[in-house]
């Protein structure tokens, strides 16, 4: 019998959860045997995109994945395809420990390979598979925001994961709006967070061999209240020839619920400030915007009668805020006619 | 560029009281934890005192707990260690330090000394 | 006492390797990233190793440090005079809720 042969008759294990992503670290040197699901008919393993070859010593064939020694080169992501559907049956990243070598002089490697529970060998005790994504300890964020701690772990059998709050168990009973708990994203999600949520939280992933835990610290920090603020240079003076298209923006940040105004500065009488001071404007448009968005003023065919100062005006329940800019509209034939008037500085205003 | 200033160092009688303050610029101070760590003359490194972004929450070393408080106003970028009832022991250079997200201090200020000396 | 133990010195002579080491705990090394700090001579301490192995812009590359388990160590490739300082590993601390710190080691370059 050829070796590939002999591997048919070894057993093979079926990756613990089907279609979620699973983490092994196998050792160096060590026989990899993984089947994809109970049939071995028209399911194949693929290797960061590429399909395995049938034949090699890292092939797909007959539905399982085999390796016969692991290699440094073998680490990566591998997919088990159902052929037809071309559904995901296992998403599977293999790892490799250097601490597990399995090659020595007084022993046989041993495979990855199951048992009578159906746990992956070796067995291991909890592990952190991207400490990077952990990196940020301490937190600081603005009350309203989202929350988001991430303890992503592997081992076998595969861990628990739990979350305490200052040391205390925490399924957020007590907090406005609850958590979402992502267990296979290893998550705590907290929206909208509150002063109240301020504190020191806590994974604690835990399997039979062992448990690891590591700690955030949370501090919210509440929005001190200020009218809308217009980024810089907003609406920007604009020069457009008769006919074309022009658009005004407008970037408004504000943390209450802003509400917009386009004005045309406009000329009465000859004037254009009333006796109270204040400048004559036609309202072109008026809007409610969500935080940090953009509003756009749509000026279409534009005429010579277009042209003068637009405002745009922001405000919420602390105060106002606007910025001015101004639009030349230039005849077709005097494309090539640029000149900075004085009046065609930007005007920047803040008022409350 | 990041700058941390302390001052309010000097002598003082074991018992007394003495006010750090650490200027910040060069940064938003306002989402930092900030720190303070003193060295006695010769030694090594000794974290003092830890306040939150919000100045909600402080942590102190078992060795100053009760008679040192630290605070921070935002408004004005600085941070403040209020020591009480000083003693001999806390003779040392205090520096201010700024705490990375990471949780290293990634600037430290030039260090202030606080002699307690009779 | 310190939380986190270092030797109190070490020495080596120019393009030589040392390495100094520093264990700690399950609630500081353990289960946080491991930091390095360089005390030059009368002067304040500047950040050398963050996040087990990760260097600030401006430190060569001379300086590398990795971390097991509750012990980290730091290692000095090519080492040169201007090395000779105090050299200090530090964690976060889950149970002080703030950074603890190695006793320092003192990092002679001979002749």
């Known amino acids: 019998l050829e070796a590939s042969e002999e591997m048919e008759q070894e057993p093979c294990l079926a990756p613990i959860l089907e279609q979620q992503e699973q983490v092994l670290t196998v050792a160096l040197g060590q026989p990899v045997r993984l089947c994809c699901g109970r049939t071995e008919r028209g399911r194949h393993w693929y290797k960061e995109g590429s399909r395995l070859a049938s034949a090699g010593r890292v092939r797909g064939w007959r539905g399982r994945l085999e390796i016969a020694s692991f290699l440094p080169e073998d680490a990566g992501r591998y997919l088990c395809l159902a052929r037809g559907s071309m559904t995901v049956v296992h998403n599977l990243t293999l790892l490799m420990d250097d601490s597990l070598t399995s090659i020595s002089n007084d022993e046989d490697p041993k495979t990855l390979s199951s048992s009578s529970s159906g746990h992956v060998y070796p067995q291991q005790a909890p592990y952190w598979t991207h400490p990077q994504r952990m990196e940020k300890k301490l937190h600081a964020v603005p009350a309203g925001n989202t929350v988001k701690f991430r303890c992503p772990a592997a081992g076998n059998p595969m861990p628990t994961i739990h979350w305490l709050k200052d040391g205390q168990a925490f399924h957020g009973e007590n907090r406005i709006g609850g958590i979402r708990l992502r267990h296979q994203h290893w998550s705590l999600v907290m929206e909208s967070v509150v002063p109240s949520d301020r504190g020191t939280y806590t994974c604690l992933v835990e399997n039979s061999l062992g448990s690891i835990r590591y700690s955030y610290l949370l501090d919210v920090l509440e929005r001190s209240p200020h009218r809308p603020i217009l980024q810089a240079g907003l609406p920007a003076n604009t020069t457009a020839v008769v006919g074309s298209d022009v658009e005004l923006l407008c970037k408004v940040y504000s943390d209450a619920q802003p509400h917009i105004q386009w004005l045309k500065h406009v000329v009465i009488n000859g004037s254009s400030f009333g006796a109270d001071g204040f400048p004559y404007v036609q309202v072109l448009k008026t809007t409610d915007i969500n935080s940090s968005e953009v509003e756009v003023l749509y000026l279409r065919n534009v005429s010579a009668e277009d042209a003068g100062e637009y405002t745009c005006l922001a405000g919420n329940s602390i105060g106002l805020s606007y910025q001015s800019a101004w639009l030349t509209v230039l005849p077709e034939e005097d494309l090539t006619w640029t000149t900075a008037t004085p009046e065609a500085a930007s005007h920047h205003h803040h008022h409350h | 560029e990041v700058q941390l200033l302390e001052s309010g160092g000097g002598l003082v009688q074991p018992g007394g009281s003495l006010r750090l303050s650490c200027a910040a610029s060069g940064f938003t101070f306002s989402p930092y934890w900030m720190g303070w760590v003193r060295q006695a003359p010769g030694k090594g490194l000794e974290w003092v005192s830890v306040?939150?972004?919000?100045?909600?929450?402080?942590d102190y070393a078992d060795s100053v707990k009760g008679r040192f408080t630290i605070s921070r106003d935002n408004s004005k970028n600085t941070l403040y260690l209020q020591m009480n009832s000083l003693r001999a022991e806390d003779t040392a250079v205090y520096y201010c330090?700024?705490?990375?997200?990471?949780?290293?201090?990634?600037?430290w200020g030039q260090g202030t000394l606080v002699t307690v000396s009779s | 006492q310190s939380e986190l133990t270092q030797p109190p010195s070490a020495s080596g002579t120019p393009g030589q390797r040392v390495t100094i080491s520093c264990s700690g705990g399950?609630?500081?090394?353990?289960?946080?990233?491991a930091h390095w700090y360089q005390q030059l001579p009368g002067t304040a301490p500047k950040l050398l190793i963050y996040?087990?192995?990760q260097r600030p812009s401006g430190v060569p590359d001379r300086f590398s440090g990795s971390k097991s388990g509750t012990s980290a160590s730091l290692a000095i490739s090519g080492l040169r005079s201007e090395d000779e300082a105090d050299y200090y590993c530090a964690a976060w601390d889950d149970s002080l809720s703030g950074p603890v710190f190695g006793g320092g080691t003192k990092l002679t370059v001979l002749g």
């Open positions: 399950y609630s500081n090394m353990g289960s946080n990233y």
């Open positions: 306040i939150w972004p919000s100045g909600g929450t402080t």
């Open positions: 330090a700024r705490v990375h997200p990471a949780g290293h201090n990634d600037h």
């Open positions: 996040n087990n192995n």
